[in-house]
Amino acid sequence: SKAVGIDLGTTYSCVAHFANDRVDIIANDQGNRTTPSFVAFTDTERLIGDAAKNQAAMNPSNTVFDAKRLIGRNFNDPEVQADMKHFPFKLIDVDGKPQIQVEFKGETKNFTPEQISSMVLGKMKETAESYLGAKVNDAVVTVPAYFNDSQRQATKDAGTIAGLNVLRIINEPTAAAIAYGLDKKGKEEHVLIFDLGGGTFDVSLLSIEDGIFEVKATAGDTHLGGEDFDNRLVNHFIQEFKRKNKKDLSTNQRALRRLRTACERAKRTLSSSAQTSVEIDSLFEGIDFYTSITRARFEELCADLFRSTLDPVEKVLRDAKLDKSQVDEIVLVGGSTRIPKVQKLVTDYFNGKEPNRSINPDEAVAYGAAVQAAILTGDESSKTQDLLLLDVAPLSLGIETAGGVMTKLIPRNSTIPTKKSEIFSTYADNQPGVLIQVFEGERAKTKDNNLLGKFELSGIPPAPRGVPQIEVTFDVDSNGILNVSAVEKGTGKSNKITITNDKGRLSKEDIEKMVAEAEKFKEEDEKESQRIASKNQLESIAYSLKNTISEAGDKLEQADKDTVTKKAEETISWLDSNTTASKEEFDDKLKELQDIANPIMSKLYQAGGAPGGAAGGAPGGFPGGAPPAPEAEGPTVEEVD
């Protein structure tokens, strides 16, 4: 089986594979090198990627996107609450976590963000398998460097649900740095990766020398990206539409989706043009919306967001104890770095230093992830043999001590993996357990930080207060995920201590159930695509027969021509009124059609009237005869999936 790198993006995802000293970015079934991180549910099927995004306007309430803005977060997270206001799909609170509620095949279904992300990952897995012609089991999956523990763990779970062995979770800017520096030899360079994507923003500062990639500091915003710029445009045009037409289109989800798509397109155009027009026919209540926007106006609408990208830049320089003049290269990653104003802000901040443009901003992350996947699975390329990746934990980890104080155990920007042990004891005689509350964040008080989990140590042997010596080890692994273990030092009865880990993540049972459900969905998708293939084949052959007969001239008797034409038209008419029929029904109809048409088509064939045949051509009949001849020599039938 093969190993791949997957950039699981907020808006688009990308998959790559490293072999024979090079990385291949793998195109999907539509020929696109990035795939929309969209999943849609309809009455008959589940759609993922381009197909899902393309029908979003027709089916807004059941087309799910932005799972990355939900994954590993609590329902009451202020950012989830803010996002909810403009999501066309329904979010519900299940045990304090957000779930997406949709109508699928006539039933109401709830999905966790992990499940939605797993569907996107599954699509990337299939894309790679089609291209590589082999099973893909192993993957390195990327996350924003500033993702916290819960978000990382949830992303890893999404990979598991997709049937992947997640070799490693790596940080997006670090992966991009590999793409930039893989072929770099020579002196030490300080490289600043500025990664502004569809929904997240990271800045990492690395030193790269002789194959050693050492992250010095990282900062970012897990809720800033291209979608926020789209939102500004959408809101601007909603107001304009109100002014012009005295109507509020924001009440209509289909109109909003059409407007958002137009805004996304306009934003892209404004990266290369100073002005663009937006033209949407019958946008709302039959009103056409024709307008234009300039680059200057767009920059004004997003000014505060663009400016805010410099805060993490300053923070990483401060944390790395470097002056901006010591940065050798600035590497721009993520589609949103194509925005000229963003580029200008960065260039101006670095006193006119131009960013390095040697890597593709859409593909660099998947590229680096593929290199790391190759390393972790034993690829012996000379390009990877010298690579050493030293990444950091983005947030300080600590525990709550008396008075709600945040006592840091692992400071932010600590090289990972890392371990820290601390001795705890009891505060009451014969106390059977200790509650340890773990937080992540930089504030002095735990109430201002993020509660990562509560770890209950139970089974402590009876003893006076302060006597038990419980050594708790905090271990941040190479994925940036925290694991906690404990030993009762005083008595050596470590096996008596159990840790109840309440990190709010999916349980092993949940994941197993979701894996099984994912398999079921995959089988249903497969069934549906076979059903569509049978439908298309029947339709294709019916039309092809009709055309062939109409061009047969006097090579067939009129009665024969009428028989085939009548049956073909009858089939087409049946298809129109039975679009949801089963595969078996389509196959039966095809057999009926063949039984009538084959003997007559054989006559035509013998008369030399249909070389190559209508559908396979040789007397073998439909389908499965000889391969179709070139177009000039007679009609061919194309099977459409």
Partner: nanobody, 110 residues
């Protein structure tokens, strides 16, 4: 599957010497960069020494005192520690290809 097993740690007096070994398996040893890292109590994990195709490199704190070497026949990488100081007390980890050993404790104390 990549496996890295460190040995040779222990208690050593200041100014003394120690030789750490790391036996590796599961990958083409001779062609890959090999690394020694350490983590002292309450400190960050740091890269101490590394040996790649361009030869060895050392952290400033151990330059001229520690030597990293490899034996490709035995699939083993060594860290020769001389003139040790109390601040060299740490758990020493061997790493390669993104994988880590379990570590070996070195304590420098009189």
């Amino acid at each position: 599957q990549v496996q890295l097993v460190e040995s040779g740690g222990g208690l050593v007096q200041p100014g003394g010497s120690l030789r750490l070994s790391c036996a590796a398996s599961g990958f083409d040893f001779s062609r890959n960069r090999l690394n020694w890292h350490r983590q002292a109590p309450g400190k960050q994990r740091e890269l101490v020494a590394t040996i790649g195709s361009n030869g060895p490199r050392y952290a400033d704190s151990v330059k001229d005192r520690f030597t990293i070497s490899r034996d490709n026949e035995k699939n083993t990488v060594y860290l020769e520690m001389n003139s040790v100081k109390p601040e060299d007390t740490a758990v020493y980890y061997c790493a390669a290809r993104g994988y880590w050993g379990q570590g070996t404790q070195v304590t420098v104390s009189s």
